[in-house]
């Protein structure tokens, strides 16, 4: 049911990475706006993005208050210039959103090599631990904040003269690997989360070679 | 139901070449790493290379490398090991796995197998 | 490459006994060491992940351990099902690599 100059909002979507949470929506409106509510399972409605045209919401500062809880979303729509309207029986028209729980569904972002460094045989690649939206005592979590041992990484790297990638893991953000002396090599790193079963590995980072600036050298 | 399915073996001739095929289903091969693993009859197990199917990174032991290519479908959802250049010493039941971490090569499930034999 | 070294090839022990299987790792390898189970005509199951933690479904009389680079294997009680040939394999580099296997026989 509802009014016959709106229509619900259908193929709604989470779109989430590190935790940037956002939820999208068709169709673009013609002659009406949306609303957005959110809750856990177990809470009260909350209203966002109050009657837009957009078709989209940022739900970011709501779950990153407890990225462990389930989310539901719900969008409502309204004809435009006349947001009182409601359906026939009683209520506006909405949709609801898949649910969502941050914590296992978020994406990984594309993770960054911060430096590596090479003593002899022995090369320390680092991670950048990457900041999210996530706050605890008014300060912002890193990745690892969050994740702590469920995140691990994975380190490629590969002879610049050769195409076989060899691999190491971590679950800190560093790694120490042995290298053949005199040559070059070059790495990509990816964030996994093992225990997840979809949503597991991030992007690759992008490549870093040595004989490139983030390199530092140091011959023992 | 999380499985690996191996086909493709058979008989061949040294020199030869052969296809083995891993179809998974029950998961996204491009969420984890596929790794080939071979046992020659009645010896132990010998890693044979991998791939991450998200990047389409490889890397293979020596034993095969430049003969052998591990390539994937991920619109298939499956992973393939081609062979060239056969030799006896080839002969092996060929499993694929799926790894449990990234990359590392710790293994949680694995296809039932399909014997390669090359052989004049 | 690092080379696993297992022992024994091959023991005979009785339903009940306590069953020790070792690896040593040629070089540090950390707690990335698996074990596997692999029964005749079979693919090869995991028992034992990172050295001492044991895979989703298989029995509590399955452990692992690690001290250095030693890595060890224990069956508490051993029961009919467990007569197998049993591998450590490091996963701590590429490539990974197998120990030559443990043939676990009925005495």
């Known amino acids: 049911s509802g009014t016959t100059n709106t229509v619900a909002a259908y193929n709604l979507t989470w779109k989430s990475t590190n935790f940037k949470t956002i939820l999208e929506w068709e169709p673009k409106p013609v002659n009406q706006v949306y609303t957005v509510q959110i809750s856990t399972k177990s809470g009260d409605w909350k209203s966002k993005c109050f009657y837009t045209t957009d078709t989209e919401c940022d739900l970011t500062d709501e779950i990153v208050k407890d990225v462990k809880q389930t989310y539901l979303a719900r969008v409502f729509s309204y004809p435009a210039g006349n947001v009182e309207s409601t359906g026939s029986a009683g209520e506006p028209l909405y949709e609801n959103s898949p649910e969502f729980t941050p914590y296992l569904e978020t994406n990984l972002g594309q993770p960054t090599i911060q430096s590596f460094e090479q003593v002899g045989t022995k090369v320390n690649v680092t991670v950048e631990d990457e900041r999210t939206l996530v706050r605890r005592n008014n300060t912002f979590l890193s990745l690892r904040d969050v994740f702590g041992k469920d995140l691990i990484y994975t380190l490629y790297y590969w002879k610049s003269s050769s195409s076989g990638k060899k691999t190491a893991k971590t679950n800190t953000n560093e790694f120490l690997i042995d290298v053949d002396k005199g040559e070059n090599y070059c790495f990509s790193v990816q964030a996994v989360i093992p225990s997840r079963t979809v949503n597991r590995k991030s992007t690759d980072s992008p490549v870093e070679c040595m004989g490139q600036e983030k390199g530092e050298f140091r011959e023992i | 139901e999380v499985q690996l399915v191996e086909s493709g073996g058979g008989l061949v001739q040294p020199g030869g070449s052969l296809r083995l095929s891993c179809a998974a289903s029950g998961f996204t091969i491009s969420d984890y790493t596929i790794h080939w693993v071979r046992q020659a009859p009645g010896k132990g197990l010998e890693w044979v290379g991998y791939?991450?199917?998200?990047?389409?990174?490889?890397y293979y032991a020596d034993s095969v490398k430049g003969r052998f290519t591990i390539s994937a479908d991920t619109s298939k959802n499956t992973a393939y090991l081609q062979m060239n250049s056969l030799r006896a010493e080839d002969t092996a039941v060929y499993y694929c796995?799926?790894?449990?971490?990234?990359?590392?090569?710790?293994?949680?499930?694995w296809g039932q197998g399909t014997l390669v034999t090359v052989s004049s | 490459d690092i080379q696993m070294t297992q022992s024994p090839s091959s023991l005979s022990a009785s339903v009940g006994d306590r069953v020790t299987i070792t690896c040593r790792a040629s070089?540090?390898?950390?707690?990335?060491v698996a074990w596997y189970q692999q029964k005749p005509g079979k693919a090869p199951k995991l028992l034992i992940y990172?050295?001492?933690f044991l895979y989703s479904g298989v029995p509590s009389r399955f452990s692992g351990s690690r001290s250095g680079t030693d890595f060890t294997l224990t069956i508490s009680s051993l029961q009919p099902e467990d007569f197998a040939t049993y591998y450590c394999q490091q996963h701590y580099t590429t490539p990974p690599t197998f120990g030559q296997g443990t043939k676990v026989e009925i005495k």
């Open positions: 990172s050295a001492s």
């Open positions: 070089q540090d390898v950390n707690t990335a």
């Open positions: 796995a799926r790894d449990i971490q990234s990359v590392s090569g710790e293994f949680d499930y």
């Open positions: 791939i991450d199917p998200s990047n389409g990174y490889t």
